[in-house]
């Protein structure tokens, strides 16, 4: 594109197109191109103490092209602008400046912040979090049985991370104490962590007590012992429905 830039032509004569190179329509030995072939842009390049005319298919960085009836001319963007559509609309600022509404600024206006990656002034983005998820089952040391007082946790997700000047995110987990009716751990449940095992959806009023099932146990067949346990659990259901969890909220 810029192959002809700065190149001196051999034996050029004023206003004579023969011998002109690099898209010139007319040229002179001293000033280079004087006019350009159709659709090419004319730009003056300073070389030492003099200016040389050059014809280009598009304007160099820091310039934009305007087509007039008599000349297609490259015009300089504003001093702080690297690439522009015209004088009013810069599209890329020079180093150390931030682009805002087509202008280049040393600092971003109030209510906006500098994005040092894109070198633009952008809206401040505040943290956004989801609603809290439901409380987890009441557990102690990772188990859902063999205790009366434990803790339960709930979490929420960060939906939008904040930008540099944005409000920080609030806590995304919350833990509180909980009290349940003490329940013996079943055989095979001992040491199992509540969160590792799939739980049946608790019935109303049973939210604080995990109901064991055969998943994760050594045998998938029901042993007489397990049948007996199930019957005991059924008997407890009535009592469990009346049992309500007493809890104290503590945010960590």
């Amino acid at each position: 594109q810029n192959a002809s830039r700065g190149r001196r032509q051999r034996r050029m004569h004023p206003n004579v197109s023969q011998g002109c190179q690099g898209g010139c329509a007319t040229c002179s030995d001293y000033n280079g191109c004087l006019s350009c072939k159709p659709r090419l842009f004319f730009v003056l390049e300073r070389i030492g103490m003099k200016q040389i005319g050059v014809c280009l298919s598009s304007c160099p960085s820091g310039y934009y092209g305007t087509r007039y009836p008599d000349i297609n001319k490259c015009t300089k963007c504003k001093a702080d602008c690297d690439t522009c559509f015209n004088k009013n609309f810069c599209t890329k600022c020079k180093s150390g400046f931030y682009l805002h509404l087509g202008k280049c600024l040393d600092n971003c206006p109030e209510g906006l912040e500098a994005n040092n990656h894109t070198m633009e002034c952008v809206n401040i983005v505040h943290c956004e979090v989801s609603e809290w998820n439901p409380w987890s089952p009441c557990t102690k040391k990772g188990k859902t049985c063999g205790f009366k007082r434990g803790t339960e946790t709930r979490v929420r997700e960060i939906m939008q991370h904040p930008s540099a000047k944005g409000n920080l995110c609030p806590p995304t987990n919350e833990t509180r104490k909980c009290t349940v009716q003490r329940k013996k751990c079943q055989k095979g449940e001992r040491g199992k962590k509540g969160r590792e095992r799939k739980r049946k959806k608790p019935n109303k009023g049973e939210s604080k007590e995990a109901i064991p099932d055969s998943k994760g146990l050594e045998s998938s067949k029901e042993t007489p012992e397990q049948r007996e346990n199930k019957q005991q659990q059924k008997k407890r259901k009535v009592q469990d429905k009346q049992q309500k969890s007493v809890s104290v909220s503590t945010v960590h």
């Epitope: 934009y64 305007t66 087509r67 007039y68 009836p69 008599d70 559509f85 015209n86 004088k87 009013n88």
Partner: antibody, heavy 116, light 107 residues
Framework: EVQLVESGGGVVQPGRSLRLSCAAS????????MAWVRQAPGKGLEWVAT????????YYRDSVKGRFTISRDNSKNTLYLQMNSLRAEDTAVYYC?????????WGQGTMVTVSS | DIQLTQSPSSLSASVGDRVTITCRAS??????LAWYQQKPGKAPKLLIY???SLIHGVPSRFSGSGSGTDFTLTISSLQPEDFATYYC?????????FGQGTKLEIK
């Protein structure tokens, strides 16, 4: 804030003259090419004339060549349009605008009515 | 002179509609095309330049596309404030010319 305010419009008889002015503020007037664009009642937009930033070159649409003259006074931040030999078809709202490929900033317009 | 022909000349639509206005040039204008919006009694306002570059502050529901001789302005979901007349303009050649306009009316 860029502001362009036109003045000088009015009712004039065919063949007479009128001079429109456009006072500019809020930007470096001497850096910008300026133009006049007109809009006949109920019609579309029509470019009339452009003058480059330093006043050294002017361009006109064919229908106004020889009758209209665009000029500027950079020391006064003012653009002018001298309209001679006015015709009925010159009736329009005349807008001044910055002209840098697109017409980025516009005045509110001044109405010129050519009628006998 | 390069002629720009807009279609349709007028268009009735409802809030929320997707609307497309076309602008056809009589010769290749590359990507030297702009779109303007004009409301009654007001000066035109530049919306888009270089076919698809949105002016800052113009809502993203406005978009432009095309090259050469065929161009479109699309409003993805019409809002009450979008009812106006829209003009295309080419700046590839002097004289810079405008399309005849497309009047967007409420249905």
């Amino acid at each position: 804030e860029v502001q362009l305010v036109e003045s000088g419009g009015g009712v004039v008889q065919p063949g007479r003259s009128l001079r429109l002015s456009c006072a500019a503020s809020g930007f470096t007037f001497s850096d910008y090419d300026m133009a006049w664009v007109r809009q006949a009642p109920g019609k579309g937009l029509e470019w009339v004339a452009t003058i480059i930033y330093d006043g050294s070159r002017t361009y006109y649409r064919d229908s106004v060549k020889g009758r209209f003259t665009i000029s500027r006074d950079n020391s006064k931040n003012t653009l002018y349009l001298q309209m001679n030999s006015l015709r009925a078809e010159d009736t329009a709202v005349y807008y001044c605008a910055t002209h840098d490929k697109t017409f980025d900033y516009w005045g509110q317009g001044t109405m010129v009515t050519v009628s006998s | 002179d390069i002629q720009l022909t807009q279609s349709p000349s007028s268009l009735s639509a409802s809030v929320g509609d997707r609307v497309t206005i076309t602008c056809r040039a009589s010769e290749d204008i590359y990507s030297d095309l702009a779109w303007y919006q004009q409301k009654p009694g007001k000066a035109p306002k530049l919306l888009i330049y270089d076919v698809n570059s949105l002016i800052h502050g113009v809502p993203s529901r406005f978009s432009g596309s095309g090259s050469g001789t065929d161009f479109t302005l699309t409003i993805s979901s019409l809002q009450p404030e979008d009812f106006a007349t829209y003009y295309c303009q080419q700046y590839d050649n002097y004289p810079n010319t405008f399309g005849q306009g497309t009047k967007l009316e409420i249905k």
